[in-house]
Interface confidence: low
């Protein structure tokens, strides 16, 4: 029995009511004053929350009853107050006292997983014992009441890959898993209370365990040989085709780099980061006529491989790529970048100038036709032979710049042009001449040996070395000449008087024939007339007045 703190005489046991009792009234216990002698003069009263509604008291005996079903998980204790009154006097026999009724637990709640849904990610190929996730169930029953809330965890689905620690709910890997075979697992966990004893309640939950990828697969070419084609006209940088390796991994672990093991001079491979295809790129132009196919060896490796996964990537996958070069109809090609020919001037019509040659670089060698653009002087035949169609005069044109085109007979769209330079070589076809018109004057009283005129000559011919001119008087003039010529041997000559005194009245003008020869082979000679006027000179022997008079006459003035 229990006496209250004040030791005033209240006597009661600890009160417990089992929850979920189905009886209409359940005896909880009895309140009693030790002053009660059983003559029914005492009256017991119950006060506080629940008094009268949940709990009632037999006023005569102090017996307390629960008249409603209780749920410990809703409320586990009730605090009430007790009074005892002497019914004869109406006065309290004992001071009012507080007491507690506890609701005792029964196992009426199953374990619940409150944190659902569970999802965990763990790397594939993780070793046994790797922690995946901890699941925790909650049981609303009283943990202090027997085993009602003592839980044990077990695996209903998930063996042999996973295991669970029975008391902690920690899920661990019990067998290595390969994401490439299966990438997610549904594990079903059961939590049982009563530590699994009979009458236990249970709850289940599902855990979705996803395997994250590790780079345990290297990329592999599915094909031993890929066939690609490229036109010989394709510029460098052209994408000529794709090759593909397959990697069972995903994301970053499936990123790959392609490379060419050989002939990296002509081709390259880049990775398309979106599709992970290898794009074969032309690095250097190809020529069908030089090489019509290539066999290249390509390999592929993952871009990111951790050190501890290197064992999976020891040997890179390789494949062959056969690149067929497609023939493209190419224009003719001249043997030389330009041609230089020489021909003598005055060569007759139809003279051979030179020969050009172009060939079709394609396999199907097309015959070539030649033509000269806009030339009246030269023509070309289908053999590339250039001939003259008119005589050439170096003094009119010393050089001809021609453009010769070569056209494929089978495809007139294929045209090439080459510059041809024709130099017209000099022949000695011009005699030297006076370089200017000479009008000379001599005084009547001139003495013998007097220099009258210095003459020079020009020659329109081109000379390989310097021109050399030879000056002479004509045979007639030499016989009876009043004048002589002296060759200075520097392409000039001087005319001198060969007598003393001249007569203006008798012979006012002399016409001297000067022969000028060049040093060409054969030498050419011209006859040039030198006019010498006889003057009535002043005392000083000046021919100026004579010259002035000639000038006036030439202008139409008379002189006396």
């Amino acid at each position: 029995d229990y006496k209250d703190d004040d030791d005033k005489g209240w006597v009661w046991n600890q009160f417990f009511v089992p929850e979920e009792m189905n009886t209409t009234s359940h005896h909880v216990g009895r309140l009693r004053s030790d002053l009660d002698n059983g003559n029914n003069s005492f009256q017991y009263k119950l006060l506080g929350a629940g008094a009268g509604s949940i709990f009632v008291i037999d006023e005569r005996t102090g017996d307390i009853y629960a008249i409603q079903k209780l749920d410990r998980e809703e409320r586990s204790l009730y605090t009430l107050r007790a009074q005892v009154i002497d019914s004869t006097t109406g006065r309290a026999v004992e001071p009012e006292s507080e007491f507690v009724i506890r609701v005792s637990d029964i196992n009426d709640n199953e374990p619940k997983f409150l944190d659902e849904p569970y999802e965990a990610i763990v790397p594939e190929m993780s070793p046994e014992g790797t922690l995946v996730i901890q699941v925790t169930a909650t049981d609303a029953d009283d943990p202090a009441s027997g085993n009602n809330a003592r839980l044990l965890y077990s695996l209903l689905q998930g063996q042999p890959y996973f295991s669970i620690e029975p008391t902690t709910g920690v899920i661990r890997i019990s067998s290595k898993m390969d994401r490439e075979l299966q990438d997610e697992y549904w594990v079903i966990i059961q939590a049982k209370d009563m530590i699994g004893l009979p009458g236990a309640l249970s709850g289940t939950t599902s855990v979705l365990i996803k395997l994250s990828d590790v780079n345990d697969n290297k990329p592999i070419f599915k094909e031993r040989l890929y066939r690609l084609t490229v036109s010989e006209s394709a510029p460098t940088g052209t994408s000529i085709g794709r090759i593909m390796a397959y990697d069972n991994d995903i994301g970053e672990n499936a990123e790959m780099d392609y490379s060419i093991e050989d002939d990296s001079q002509t081709f390259d491979i880049i990775t398309n980061n979106e599709t992970q295809e290898g794009i074969v790129i032309l690095k250097k132009k190809v020529d069908f006529e030089h090489q019509n196919h290539y066999l290249i060896r390509a390999n592929v490796k993952n871009r990111h491989v951790a050190e501890h996964l290197m064992e999976y990537h020891v040997e890179a996958s390789t494949t062959f790529v056969r690149v067929q070069v497609e023939d493209e109809d190419e224009p003719p090609v001249f043997l030389l970048p330009y041609y230089l020919f020489e021909i003598l001037e005055e060569s007759p019509h139809g003279s051979f100038v030179g020969m050009v040659s172009a060939t079709d670089p394609d396999q199907r060698k097309s015959p070539i036709r030649y033509s000269i653009t806009r030339s009246k002087v030269f023509s070309i035949d289908d053999n590339g032979t250039i001939i003259t169609t008119n005589p050439l005069d170096r003094e009119i044109s010393a050089w001809y710049n021609l453009s010769i085109t070569a056209t494929e007979k089978y495809n007139v769209q294929q045209i090439s042009a080459v510059p041809v330079y024709v130099q017209v070589l000099n022949i000695n076809d011009h005699a030297p001449e006076f370089s200017e018109y000479y009008d000379s004057y001599v005084c009547e009283n001139a003495g013998s040996g007097q220099v009258i005129q210095t003459i020079s000559a020009v020659d329109r011919d081109e000379s390989v070395e310097d021109h050399h001119f030879y000056f002479n008087l004509s045979v007639e003039d030499t016989k009876n000449s009043s004048f002589i010529i002296i060759d200075n041997e520097d392409n000039t000559a001087v005319i001198l008087t060969n007598r003393t005194g001249f007569s203006l009245q008798e012979e006012p003008v002399f016409y001297i024939s000067v022969l000028i020869a060049d040093n060409g082979i054969p030498s050419l000679t011209s006859t040039n007339t030198l006019t010498i006027h006889i003057c009535d000179c002043d005392d000083y022997g000046s021919t100026q007045t004579c010259r002035d008079k000639d000038l006036l006459l030439s202008m139409g003035f008379r002189t006396e």
Partner: antibody
Framework: QVQLVQSGAEVKKPGASVKVSCKAS????????MSWVRQAPGQGLEWMGI????????TYAQKFQGRVTMTGDTSTSTVYMELSSLRSEDTAVYYC?????????????WGQGTLVTVSS | HSVLTQSPSASGTPGQRVTISCSGS????????VNWYQQLPGTAPKLLIY???QRPSGVPDRFSGSKSGTSASLAISGLQSEDEADYYC???????????FGGGTKLTVLG
Amino acid sequence: QVQLVQSGAEVKKPGASVKVSCKASRYTFTSYYMSWVRQAPGQGLEWMGIIHPSGGDTTYAQKFQGRVTMTGDTSTSTVYMELSSLRSEDTAVYYCARGGIKLWLHFDYWGQGTLVTVSS
Amino acid sequence: HSVLTQSPSASGTPGQRVTISCSGSRSNIGSNFVNWYQQLPGTAPKLLIYTNNQRPSGVPDRFSGSKSGTSASLAISGLQSEDEADYYCAVWDDSLNGWVFGGGTKLTVLG
């Protein structure tokens, strides 16, 4: 143009086997996979399996595993599909279809089909 | 039942636009190319669309294909009477390690 020519119609009794041929021409036979697809009367298309003629590698649909055998003869550019333990539900038109250079690439050319009737 | 789901029938009048859908999963449409085949009555199937959206030569540009996630669709614009046929989607399935076809959609051109 690629051509796939299949053998003629067959009538078989339940429990027997049938071997359908598919002769390929006008392409490099050894470069492409060949699949077999069947179509029961009034039904959809059903993939049976695939063979790579150069190495003879095969992959069969789970449903036909153990009953179907696919072979290739590179000398005649012909693939064969043999289906054993025939039952009435195997009555269908059987097509060969040229695949790509990868298992997972589309079928671009189809044979004209071979009707196999299984009846007692 | 098929791994790929197609509605069994579709219809439209000449000139209309019709869309046929094909639904799959991550292991097939989600990670591989989708192809579409047209089967005219009494003939072998014919490739209509390959690698999601490419048309073989000879297929009019009225036919177009697209893919998003684990679904694909075939659109036919300017519908013509000769388009009346069965249409099948097909794709490689990584999990099954084999090809799978949709159940087929019968397209009827009305009027």
